[in-house]
């Protein structure tokens, strides 16, 4: 038999991408019962957690105070239930943004446009990088990226009004140091009459999933939390 | 039960390479950090570097760079250590440790000895 | 580096007796963990994350500290105790442990 427990789950509250000086908050989401919690930063042992009482929440919360690029990276997390570790959670990234300067986002032929179209982003920022971010709002997780001295053009190919949206740019000093965003570009895609008049517009909420999702158990949840484990059992 | 069984004791010549290796079972390999640690006979413990299994990534202290170099087979479920160009100071026992909360599952150690 | 710093270098009790070594960093670590080796072995987990005993270790160990000084505590030392004892951080790269505290029964 296996001598661990199912990964936990790693989120970022709110956001992966944290102003400097502000806090960051990751959840690791584990299990009922869990008696210790670590988060682990680069291979590093980052903070350890132990929640209390722990049979009746199924993850902590791990606050950084003051980000800065010394804090940026890799994060994962992994817990205890008696003796018994977990297995590590995927890697979570964590990105310090409003580093040095504010880049300058520009869109051609313009920012109304007719779907079919061929559209390009242009992102550009005087001090030094090479790497250039961009992304569409409610879809933080969608990140382009392209390479240039001062300026990087993200071409978008014939846009449908899927891509309608608020778009923001950040020039990068390494993968999880980024610039001050970029003022925001909306999109306007036109399209047929019938598919304009169906066509969402892009929630300007975070996204969905960067919220942790932490419980304190009921009876019916523990039910259900022995019935998977038991069934889980069986499947191996 | 979870083991990390290292290859056995090894004696090379000064200027010559060679590599270690540490096989892992009883869990799910790629799921936890492997780090290599040497100890030279009769002192302390230095730690050379870590590889991440599920990617390949490694991680060394500097002053095991150009010395030691760390890889894995996921398909064996085995981390390596090749080190470059021995001399006496690499004379040492090697161990591989697991981290999962803690450096919870250690190698039993390989005998490394340089001689002419 | 974080340089860690043990004393004693050599620990010499009697059965029965509550003994205490300590552990400095040269500057704050979130974290210290112990190992526990004995002559011809591998160093096993001893104590981590600080106060944490890891799998199999009697309740007589102890671990406190913060910051730069950390300590590990045998409330009532046993013959079986007789090891050296390590300190170690992997909260900065490179991780670092301490030259270790041989602990002799007298």
């Known amino acids: 038999p296996k001598q661990t427990l199912p990964k936990p789950i790693i989120r970022a509250e709110s956001t992966y991408m944290v102003p400097k000086e502000k806090q960051a908050t990751l959840c690791c989401q584990g299990s009922y019962g869990a008696v210790e919690y670590q988060l682990h930063f680069e291979g590093s042992l980052f903070a350890v957690e132990r929640p209390k009482p722990p049979e009746r929440i199924n993850g902590v919360k791990f606050h950084i105070p003051d980000m800065n690029s010394r804090k940026a990276g890799r994060y994962s997390c992994i817990y205890r239930v008696g003796e018994l570790w977990s297995e590590r959670s995927d890697l979570l990234d964590l990105v310090v943004t409003e580093m040095y300067d504010t880049p300058t986002l520009s869109v051609h032929p313009g920012p109304e446009v007719t779907s079919g179209e061929k559209v390009t982003f242009y992102c550009r920022l005087d001090t030094a990088t090479s790497m250039f971010l961009l992304l569409k709002e409610g879809r933080s997780r969608d990140v382009q990226r392209s390479y240039g001295k001062v300026q990087a053009e993200f071409p978008m190919g014939p846009v449908t009004t899927a891509h309608r949206g608020s778009y923001r740019c950040f020039g990068s000093y390494n993968n999880y140091a980024w610039s001050f965003p970029s003022e925001p570009v909306k999109l306007l895609v036109t399209g047929d009459i019938e598919n304009t008049s169906l066509a969402p517009t892009d929630p300007t909420f975070p996204d969905s999933w960067d919220t942790c999702l932490l419980t304190r158990e009921t009876g019916l949840q523990k039910d259900l939390a022995l019935w998977d484990h038991t069934a889980q059992n069986l499947l191996r | 039960q979870v083991q990390l069984q290292q290859s056995g004791d090894d004696l090379v010549k000064p200027g010559a390479s060679v590599k270690l290796s540490c096989k892992a079972s009883?869990?799910?390999?790629?799921?936890?950090?492997i780090n290599w640690i040497k100890q030279r006979p009769g002192q302390g413990l230095e730690w050379i570097g870590r590889?991440?299994?599920?990617?390949?990534?490694?991680y060394y202290n500097e002053i095991f760079k150009g010395k030691a170099i760390l890889t894995v087979d996921s398909y064996s479920n085995t981390a390596y250590i090749q080190l470059r160009s021995v001399s006496s100071e690499d004379s040492a026992v090697y161990f591989c440790?697991?981290?999962?909360?803690?450096?919870?599952?250690w190698g039993q150690g390989i005998t490394l000895t340089v001689s002419s | 580096q974080i340089v860690l710093s043990q004393s004693p270098a050599i620990l010499s009790a009697s059965p029965g007796e509550k003994v205490t070594m300590a552990c400095r960093a040269s500057?704050?670590?979130?974290?210290i963990h112990w190992y526990q080796q004995r002559p011809g072995s591998s160093p096993k987990p001893w104590i981590y994350?600080?106060?944490s005993l890891a799998s199999g270790v009697p309740a007589r160990f102890s671990g406190s500290g913060s910051g730069t000084s950390y300590s590990l505590t045998i409330s009532r030392v046993e013959a079986e105790d007789a090891a050296t004892y390590y300190c170690?951080?992997?909260?900065?790269?490179?991780?670092?442990f301490g030259g270790g505290t041989k602990l002799e029964m007298k």
């Open positions: 500057s704050s670590v979130n974290y």
């Open positions: 009883g869990y799910t390999f790629t799921s936890y950090w």
């Open positions: 994350a600080t106060s």
């Open positions: 170690q951080q992997w909260s900065s790269n490179p991780y670092t």
């Open positions: 590889v991440v299994p599920g990617s390949g990534r490694t």
């Open positions: 440790a697991r981290v999962g909360g803690y450096w919870d599952y």
